[in-house]
């Protein structure tokens, strides 16, 4: 995940972090009527050897972790990404100013894992 | 994905990279009979604004990209992770030295995206 971050300290393990997103902050307040925002959350943290059960790692991620240990210059660690996502319902104006209620898939992170 | 890398230059966009994994290199040659290795591949690259169609981005990744632009110190970019994974069949010795043929899921990266 945070590929452009440099940190001299050990990062925490891959996990879900809370994040509230305000549609006003995104500049979407003129077309989204409701909600005003939502708990989107995000994934961040290290996917380091050994990958434990909490990390929901795929078989590929386990293999990639081992290859990274041997070839860190060439192959990155797996990354911390959503494993479960939920939808939210949004009330908004379409291009013709009609009010629409639509369910947007994959908007909320419920769980994270190493991929 | 390569969260512990520092790079002074622009990284290429999220994509699949070829990677052949030798079971001998992993130290698994004593229990895996066949194959000797396989094309595992891996995902790497930037998930930067704007996320184009090739990046198979989820709605959450699109939102997270916008939040990252506004708050890069707090929220990372989405990460480049597998979106399609394939299985491989492996012939191996179990703990009782029986020869087993088993299909291992999620071993090969077929496609990558921003998550």
């Amino acid at each position: 995940s945070a590929s452009d971050y440099n940190s001299s300290e050990l990062k925490t393990a891959c996990r879900k972090h809370e994040l509230y997103v305000s549609f006003q902050d995104l500049g979407w307040q003129d077309w989204i009527i409701a909600p005003k925002g939502y708990a989107a959350n995000y994934c961040d943290g290290e996917c380091s050897f050994p990958l434990n059960a909490h990390m929901n790692a795929t078989n590929h991620a386990i293999v990639q972790t081992l290859v990274h240990l041997m070839n860190p210059e060439y192959v990155p660690k797996p990354c911390c990404a959503p494993t479960k996502l939920n939808a939210i319902s949004v009330l908004y104006f379409d291009d013709n100013s009609n009010v629409i209620l639509k369910k947007y898939r994959n908007m909320v992170v419920r769980a994270c894992g190493c991929h | 994905s390569a969260s512990d890398y520092n790079s002074s230059e622009l990284k290429t966009a999220c994509r699949k990279h070829e990677l052949y994994v030798s079971f001998q290199d992993l130290g698994w040659q004593d229990w895996i009979i066949a194959p000797k290795g396989y094309a595992a591949n891996y995902c790497d690259g930037e998930c930067s604004f704007p996320l184009n169609a090739h990046m198979n981005a989820t709605n959450h990744a699109i939102v997270q990209t916008l939040v990252h632009l506004m708050n890069p110190e707090y929220v990372p970019k989405p990460c480049c992770a597998p979106t399609k994974l394939n299985a491989i069949s492996v012939l191996y010795f179990d703990d009782n030295s029986n020869v087993i043929l088993k299909k291992y899921r999620n071993m090969v990266v077929r496609a990558c995206g921003c998550h």
Epitope: H68, E73 | S22, D25
Partner: antibody, heavy 118, light 107 residues
Framework: QVQLVQSGAEVKKPGASVKVSCKAS????????IHWVRQAPGQRLEWMGW????????KYSQKFQGRITITRDTSASTAYMELSSLRSEDTAVYYC???????????WGQGTLVTVSS | EIVMTQSPATLSVSPGERATLSCRAS??????LAWYQQKPGQAPRLLIY???TRATGIPARFSGSGSGTEFTLTISTLQSEDFAVYYC?????????FGPGTKVDIK
């Protein structure tokens, strides 16, 4: 044939910086990583950091984090290691070494002696 | 971090004799072990990799063996040019680490 040729010896004052170069020839520069290893007088070899010459990714030893910068110029097939805030214990021979995927350090530069003295 | 230890620290051998150098890893490193030779004022030179494979141009008198945590470098018949310091290095798990070296000197 593969060669890594390093810049010449340097004498620096405490607090100064040094930049050592490592020019590669005889192979495709961007297909390998360049590592930097140092050896203080009578000491064992100590890994400092690496750069993937293809994509520019770097990784530094925790010991040198914040003081070391490794860069490369692909057009010149040259890698550079800069060490800042030098102290007397940084007096050592600094080596660059090439590493391919799944391999050890197969070719080394001749070494650059850096002496830190007031 | 995997710690590499070497023994003996110094080995005194006469030219023409056999030299056996040992290297131990603090945990299993499969066969990902290399041996380097370093002469005074020179850079290390790769001798053996993958525990037992000789690098390009390395004479047959150098051989490597072992697996897991215990490794050996053998110089079957010591030549005058073989008196040097020998380092082992594991390249199985990052960070790759070197042993402290074994100095082979003339008896």
């Amino acid at each position: 044939q593969v060669q890594l040729v390093q810049s010449g010896a340097e004498v620096k004052k405490p607090g100064a910086s040094v930049k050592v170069s490592c020019k590669a020839s005889g192979y495709t520069f961007t297909s390998y990583a360049i590592h930097w290893v140092r050896q203080a007088p009578g000491q064992r070899l100590e890994w400092m950091g690496w750069i993937n010459a293809g994509n520019g990714n770097t990784k530094y030893s925790q010991k040198f984090q914040g003081r070391i910068t490794i860069t490369r110029d692909t057009s010149a097939s040259t890698a550079y290691m800069e060490l800042s805030s030098l102290r007397s214990e940084d007096t050592a021979v600094y080596y660059c070494a090439r590493r391919g995927f799944g391999e050890p350090f197969d070719y080394w530069g001749q070494g650059t002696l850096v002496t830190v003295s007031s | 971090e995997i710690v590499m230890t070497q023994s003996p620290a110094t080995l005194s051998v006469s030219p023409g004799e056999r030299a056996t150098l040992s290297c131990r890893a603090s945990q299993s490193i499969s066969s990902n072990l290399a041996w380097y030779q370093q002469k005074p004022g020179q850079a290390p030179r790769l001798l053996i990799y993958g525990t037992s494979t000789r690098a390009t141009g390395i004479p047959a008198r150098f051989s490597g063996s072992g697996s897991g945590t215990e490794f050996t470098l053998t110089i079957s018949t010591l030549q005058s040019e073989d008196f040097a310091v020998y380092y082992c290095q594991q390249y199985n798990i990052w960070p790759f680490t070197f042993g402290p070296g074994t100095k082979v000197d003339i008896k």
